[in-house]
């Protein structure tokens, strides 16, 4: 099989995030530039016919063209050690250093990069490159989709005809890897909350690095953290009212630790919402703020949004709980003009408290108004 | 989930043509080289051709140069193999496969030469 | 033409112990700073080939990790550590390094 999508997220992975060069013409730039171009030809044999292929060369030519990078030089030395693919191992470790990803990750180079994506309330998302969204996504959609780990939620109506939705259930495939956990599910419905996974066990079953998946319970029926060691990863799953909520820590090289673009690279969390599933609520925050609850039946995704919740008092429940005026505070705000349903807040104050404990940039725990963003 | 289903095979005489077809879903089918891949009755697999994503290049095996032509229509997610002054040893199942190194496959179709 | 040579010829082995197959090419099959294209196929009685194995020793998605292959250069193994019924068959080598592509002619595997 082709593999010129791991040569795309090393280079994606060398030149953003924390450790990316300071400016695109950067000898730093231009040296990850010479590392793509020379991936992509290791890997013409097996992709010489596919688009990704092509994309991929023409992409490094207009690139080293654009920024003037020699083709000789030097090339970056890859930031990121390699994943094998799951259960591509092909000799045993006795050693639980492999199911430690930061362990092993540090004998090769820097920390690892670590993402964020969470989802909540009506629902909003926030995805893994900080791009925050209002969706409509009714039924199942998968919210991650890669080589490790498969998370899929199925989202229900807020109220009868509303376009509005919110998570009442969630379903995590963590997938068979090497020497450190056989696969395991778990899954959370309305009223719900395990903390264990479908077979009743706790972690990663009888392999030697089986306490690298672990699952523990932070408030009965209300709040559960999966820790996945071996891919550096960290789950919250909240109940909060009738409602679920999900966020995530997670590397960048696991992020993109996709076979196949075309039918995993869809998820969620890495591409946003399809544009046809997105609410402009920025739209209809600033209808609502000029003309009060009464206009709301011609921004609101929910026709049958109570009027009994005036704006005013939406506003003061939220600041109480949000008091920065991000967007956390303002999906608050909608979520509780288009529901009525004041858990709504606590939905919006718990993502936020997760944003705080999950995001690896503290500088970009708040996300202010602007343009709505396009898929990725 | 990937499916290529084949078509087209049949009895036909030695120096006649025919037009295999593979009919793909599961995946973008104009992003990917697709093969085809032939087997003789019980013998193993001999490479026949593939195709670029776009029909820009196209590879053959010796034995069908000149003979066989491969093509797509990307609108249609179908892949064609036209056989031209068809011999008696092409009697085989052809396969078509997608990528540019074939990962999955078709069930493939039998193909007889014969007078 | 690259030849792949493949042994043995057929191979009967019991459930549970391990089979072993090898295939030698007529050149080496390294491409690039060691990036080497040799795959392996499973053809199941009355089925298509399904892929195992590509770039030597990369388990194809879905495949056991009993499916081990490892090898360099023009030598390349296949070992079954535990051998179970769905896994007779034909296994066929197949190089994508040089044009055109080759397969090897086929290591049948048979339950003892």
């Known amino acids: 099989p082709c593999k010129i999508l791991k040569c795309n997220s090393e280079f994606w992975s060398a030149t953003s995030g924390s450790h990316a060069p300071a400016s695109d013409d950067t000898p730093e730039f231009c040296a990850a530039l010479r590392s793509y171009a020379l991936c992509t030809r290791r890997t013409a044999r097996t992709c010489r016919g596919d688009l990704a292929y092509h994309s991929a060369v023409h992409g490094i030519e207009d690139l080293m063209s654009q920024h003037n990078c020699s083709k000789d030089g030097p090339t970056s030395q890859p930031r990121l050690r390699t994943l094998p693919p799951a259960g591509d191992s092909q000799e045993r470790s006795d050693s639980p250093e492999i199911c430690h990803y930061e362990k092993s990750f540090h004998k090769h180079s820097a920390t690892p990069n670590y993402t964020h994506c969470g989802l909540f309330g009506d629902p909003h998302l926030r995805t893994f490159t900080d791009r925050f969204q209002t969706c409509k996504v009714q039924g199942a959609w998968p919210l991650i989709d890669n080589n490790y780990l498969n998370v899929q939620v199925t989202n229900t109506p807020v109220l009868p005809g509303s376009a509005a939705t919110a998570t009442s259930k969630l379903t995590i495939i963590f997938k068979n890897f090497q020497e450190c956990v056989d696969q395991k599910v778990y899954q959370a419905e309305m009223d719900e909350l395990p903390a264990a996974f479908v077979d009743g066990s706790k972690n990663g079953g009888d392999k030697h690095g089986a306490n690298s998946l672990k699952i523990t319970e932070k408030v009965s029926g209300q709040h559960v953290e999966i820790q996945a060691k071996y891919i550096g990863t960290t789950i919250v799953v909240r109940q909060v009212g009738r409602y679920l909520t999900f966020a995530v820590r997670m590397p960048e090289e696991v992020v993109n630790a996709v076979e196949d673009w075309d039918s995993q690279g869809l998820y969620l969390c890495l591409r946003g919402c399809p544009l046809n599933q997105q609410i402009d609520f920025q739209a209809f925050h600033t209808n609502a703020e000029g003309t009060g609850a009464r206009r709301l039946a011609a921004a609101s995704p929910a026709p049958t949004a109570p009027e009994t919740f005036p704006y005013e008092t939406a506003v003061a429940k939220c600041k109480e709980k949000l008091p920065v005026e991000d967007l956390y505070y303002q999906a608050c705000v909608f979520d509780l003009l288009t529901t009525g349903d004041v858990n709504f807040t606590l939905a919006a104050y718990y993502a936020l408290e997760d944003v705080k404990m999950l995001h690896s940039n503290k500088d970009k725990l708040h996300l202010y108004e602007r343009t709505r963003d396009l898929p990725g | 989930e990937v499916q290529l289903v084949e078509s087209g095979g049949g009895l036909v005489q030695p120096g006649s043509s025919l037009k295999l077809s593979c009919v793909a879903s599961?995946?973008?089918?104009?992003?990917?080289?697709m093969n085809w891949i032939r087997q003789a009755p019980k013998k193993g697999l001999e490479w026949i051709g593939m195709?670029?994503?776009?029909?820009?290049?196209?590879h053959y095996a010796d034995s069908v140069k000149g003979r066989f032509t491969i093509s797509r229509d990307n609108s249609k997610n179908t892949l064609y193999l036209e056989m031209n002054s068809l011999r008696s040893e092409d009697t085989a199942i052809y396969y078509c496969?997608?990528?540019?190194?074939?990962?999955?496959w078709g069930q493939g179709v039998m193909v007889t030469v014969s007078s | 033409d690259v030849v792949l040579t493949q042994t043995p010829v057929s191979l009967s082995v019991t459930l549970g112990d391990q089979a072993s197959m090898s295939c030698r090419s007529s050149?080496?099959?390294?491409?690039?700073?060691?990036?080497?294209?040799l795959e392996w196929f499973l053809q199941k009685p009355g089925q298509s080939p399904q892929l195992l194995i590509y770039?030597?020793?990369n388990r194809f998605s879905g495949v056991p990790d009993r499916f081990i292959g490892s090898g360099s250069g023009t030598d390349f193994t296949l070992k079954i550590s535990r051998v179970e019924p769905e896994d007779l068959g034909v296994y066929y080598c197949?190089?994508?390094?040089?044009?055109?592509?080759?397969f090897g002619s086929g290591t049948k595997l048979e339950i003892k």
């Open positions: 496969a997608k990528g540019t190194t074939p990962d999955y």
């Open positions: 599961g995946f973008t089918f104009s992003n990917y080289g």
């Open positions: 195709i670029y994503y776009d029909s820009s290049e196209k």
């Open positions: 050149q080496s099959l390294e491409y690039s700073d060691g990036y080497t294209f």
């Open positions: 770039e030597v020793s």
């Open positions: 197949f190089q994508a390094t040089h044009d055109p592509l080759t």
